[in-house]
Amino acid sequence: HTAAQDNCTCPTNKMTVCSPDGPGGRCQCRALGSGMAVDCSTLTSKCLLLKARMSAPKNARTLVRPSEHALVDNDGLYDPDCDPEGRFKARQCNQTSVCWCVNSVGVRRTDKGDLSLRCDELVRTHHILIDLRHRPTAGAFNHSDLDAELRRLFRERYRLHPKFVAAVHYEQPTIQIELRQNTSQKAAGDVDIGDAAYYFERDIKGESLFQGRGGLDLRVRGEPLQVERTLIYYLDEIPPKFSMKRLTA
């Protein structure tokens, strides 16, 4: 992995251990928890990052209303099962044999069941709505400047192709970033919107996953953009399947 060559570290993932025992004696970086080799020239998949996190030593100017089928990650952290490519397996189970189905970003999309629960396919999350509230500022940010800065951030920091940033909405103090990426649109080598959103979420929380880089310093025309609340909604290509009991709760 050439990006890790110089001093044998992984610039895009601090949750790795790198050693000079790769092919040809080159630097090779492996994700904590799974032991899988990672490509340090791009983002690591969210599944491998969550697994590493769990294993680490306990050390139009109108805002979008999320669809009724939008999912929010209310379950928090868990130790996921990842497939050979580092993506989430469609069915996840905990150590007490409670199982559930997840989407491509690892968010639960069914009621919890037992080991007999079937999850036939990994349903793709094709639309992510990142809802931010920024801290009070002297005045509102210029919308086009804000739009340009956030698009630059996703392109340069997270290597997400600009076509996948569908829109940036702003009504002070709320900012919404829409990411869209259908299965048919995602080419080999394209960063997944779910991975980009996860890196962004960790950056916003001051928990950057990048090695040795300073934290995220977001500025719009020199004015710091400080986020005080983040909500992320996930929309799947197939709507989730929850019982009415949950929907009315």
């Epitope: 044998c8 025992d21 092919p23 032991g35 490509d39 050979p84």
Partner: antibody, heavy 116, light 111 residues
Framework: QVQLQQSGAELVRPGTSVKMSCKAA????????IGWVKQRPGHGLEWIGD????????NYNEKFKGKATLTADTSSSTAYMQLSSLTSEDSAIYYC?????????WGQGTLVTVSA | DIVLTQSPASLAVSLGQRATISCRAS??????????MHWYQQKPGQPPKLLIK???NLESGVPARFSGSGSGTDFTLNIHPVEEEDTATYYC?????????FGGGTKLEIK
């Protein structure tokens, strides 16, 4: 040159513990994983786990969780493996090796015999 | 866990002929760049010795008569021409994900 020197053979009682060592020389100890492998006659090779001395990170084969504990002392460039609650099933040769997979240098092995 | 199945369990090859050992993984252990499969030789009373790393990379000091090939789930170790000193047990091992399992071994005898 790179060398991994393992501690001598152990004869131990069932139910007790044993701690074996693997002293590294000839390379930067903190830069490489040290893996541990079990070999019983007729049972081939079993990967137990590995440790990265540079940060103390460990990985274990689920089968050996609770049985094996891997540690490393960077000041003496020595990796250790402790085996607990020993039974006859733990009688085997245990090897340490440098590297995650594709271990390029191996210790000579430590024979552990569990007998009453 | 990834299961590695070696075949044959044993084989006898005439001096100077070709020995072919197969290792099949229960899932792919390759990316577009590399295959995370390695081959070892073990003689009685000795630790394993690394022969081939990353499916086809010959370790330094290992004779050129040893070669490795394959990707995805199917890998092969070839020895040609075999020599007397190649009598040993050969193991494959993956390093795709934890645990880094070994194959069951192939015992090679020279006729």
């Amino acid at each position: 040159q790179v060398q991994l020197q393992q501690s001598g053979a152990e004869l131990v009682r069932p139910g007790t513990s044993v701690k074996m060592s693997c002293k590294a020389a000839g390379y930067t100890f903190t830069n490489y994983w040290i893996g541990w492998v079990k070999q019983r006659p007729g049972h081939g090779l079993e990967w137990i786990g590995d440790i990265y001395p540079g940060g103390g990170y460990t990985n274990y084969n689920e089968k050996f969780k609770g049985k094996a504990t891997l540690t490393a002392d960077t000041s003496s460039s020595t990796a250790y493996m402790q085996l607990s609650s020993l039974t006859s099933e733990d009688s085997a040769i245990y090897y340490c090796a440098r590297g995650t997979g594709g271990g390029d240098y191996w210790g000579q092995g430590t024979l552990v015999t569990v007998s009453a | 866990d990834i299961v590695l199945t070696q075949s044959p369990a044993s084989l006898a090859v005439s001096l100077g002929q070709r020995a072919t050992i197969s290792c099949r993984a229960s899932q792919s252990v390759s990316t577009s760049s590399y295959s995370y499969m390695h081959w070892y030789q073990q003689k009685p009373g000795q630790p394993p010795k690394l022969l081939i790393k990353y499916a086809s990379n010959l370790e330094s000091g290992v004779p050129a008569r040893f070669s490795g090939s394959g990707s995805g789930t199917d890998f092969t170790l070839n020895i040609h021409p075999v020599e007397e000193e190649d009598t040993a047990t050969y193991y494959c091992q993956h390093s795709w994900e934890i645990p880094y399992t070994f194959g069951g071994g192939t015992k090679l005898e020279i006729k």
